[in-house]
Amino acid sequence: RPSFSLVEDTTLEPEEPPTKYQISQPEVYVAAPGESLEVRCLLKDAAVISWTKDGVHLGPNNRTVLIGEYLQIKGATPRDSGLYACTASRTVDSETWYFMVNVTDAISSGDDEDDTDGAEDFVSENSNNKRAPYWTNTEKMEKRLHAVPAANTVKFRCPAGGNPMPTMRWLKNGKEFKQEHRIGGYKVRNQHWSLIMESVVPSDKGNYTCVVENEYGSINHTYHLDVVERSPHRPILQAGLPANASTVVGGDVEFVCKVYSDAQPHIQWIKHVEKNGSKYGPDGLPYLKVLKHSGINSSNAEVLALFNVTEADAGEYICKVSNYIGQANQSAWLTVLPKQQAPGREKEITASPDYLE
């Protein structure tokens, strides 16, 4: 058994007061699929700004534009939803601001009443012009995939016309959709050609088809509903932290690990060590030493400070964070240079995040 155990009943033991972490929900920016979204990084005096999404570095691409302190997402999709962060790097320190992006078609419960154009969807025809059903507003039907957070209200619309006035019915997964198929039932607003489901749950996921018909014909349109579940998540670590560092023998160095967690996080700083000249025990497991962990007797656990370093301090340092949901870890390397060799500015080079995915 290794002389140093990574976790000996401490993995889940978070006692550090939560003031060090942004545990309260960050600001939420909402966009509908297809819309563009622009967010300004609300940090001052930023020399360099870096962006992450769900703890992973975010770079520019054909839909993501990064200009100064602005992030632009063009043609948003539900996949763009997540926890974003901008980090302002200054000459002496860095600061991170978190925000959520939610790309969804969800409406609030009252929104089904605000259809100012609803009456225009209900087209009255000259009684002589017999006509099979047709769509009157295809723009309102373009978004076929609706990804909606649980407990939100969903509205599907199929504005149609025809003569005589068509009737509308709804199918779920190709079968008649009955009120008893979901707790709380659903509403149909015939004059708005809409189906409304309040407080959606995971069992509401599926394909919803409106069938509009009269004696001259029938048309249909299918929407897909995905209910995005809402539950606490494991910790998220700021990408690129801790960062690689170098110093001379006798120097001091600091590693920083920035944590986002909506459940109280427990932080451990861990180093691979050697025993009897070996890095691994007889069972093949590495020897690991917990250098610091959050708790009553430890100061700011997000920072590991090493003073008067020796060559033996060189190596990989792991920031491991856990809550009762899960874990995340990232690591950085310390290079210790001989006294005569001045340290480079390697601290500005970030290590590749070592995710537990």
């Epitope: 976790v7 009943d9 889940l12 978070p14 494991r234 009762y324 874990q327 995915e357």
Partner: antibody, heavy 113, light 107 residues
């Protein structure tokens, strides 16, 4: 969707051991703690311990640390809870739970001579 | 270990009533508290996490409040399906202790 399916009821004699399984599906097994909770007949809930399947990290309630062993098999997405040296007060329903959000149906263990 | 004390241990109420259950921690647990509902012969169901956040698929008549040592679960208008036992749980530090439970019965 997320599912945790536990093994069936067990009847054991005092001093014996029991191994309860909890098979997970519908999510990335490695990424979430699996917790075990005991509920004796007519009693409340008691946390026994947890395991993180990705690396096997475990944490135990001191009351169960000596007799309970949690293991995970990532190849089958299954977690096991073994309880040794059984006594009558171990008669209970044992639940596994993914981060307390999703729960198994429970496994009844009866210890009787 | 952190002790969790729930009150009352049982209560009788009618459909439509507003019901409040309290939970007190023996020390500061910040917002690290979950609430569960359990019906006979069934596994517990997560209602509220992080003291105030409604879990998936939980009706909005349930709400949680409090931080530090004092917490409350409120059911704004009791429904027939809400008659059950409710537990609070410390999720700040191990062992993750539960309250003794509050049984909500039909008056």
């Amino acid at each position: 969707q997320v599912q945790l399916v536990q093994s069936g009821a067990e009847v054991k004699k005092p001093g014996a051991s029991v191994k309860v399984s909890c098979k997970a599906s519908g999510y990335i097994f490695r990424n979430y703690y699996i917790h075990w909770v005991k509920q004796a007949p007519g009693q409340g809930l008691e946390w026994m311990g947890a395991i993180y399947p990705d690396n096997g990290d475990t944490s135990y309630n001191q009351r169960f640390k000596v007799r309970a062993t949690l293991t995970a098999d990532t190849s089958t997405s299954t977690v096991y809870m073994e309880l040794s040296s059984l006594r009558s007060e171990d008669t209970a329903v044992y639940y596994c739970a993914r981060a307390f959000t999703y729960w198994g149906q429970g496994t009844t263990v009866t210890v009787s001579s | 270990d952190i002790q969790m004390t729930q009150s009352p241990s049982s209560l009788s109420a009618s459909v439509g009533d507003r019901v409040t259950i309290t939970c007190r921690a023996s020390e500061n647990i910040y917002g690290a508290l979950n609430w569960y509902q359990q019906k006979p012969g069934k596994a517990p169901k997560l209602l509220i996490y992080g003291a105030t956040n409604l879990a998936d698929g939980v009706p909005s008549r349930f709400s949680g409040s409090g931080s530090g040592t004092d917490f409350t679960l409120t059911i704004s208008s009791l429904q027939p399906e809400d008659f059950a036992t409710y537990y609070c749980q410390n999720v700040l530090s191990t062992p993750y202790t539960f309250g003794g439970g509050t049984k909500v019965e039909i008056k």
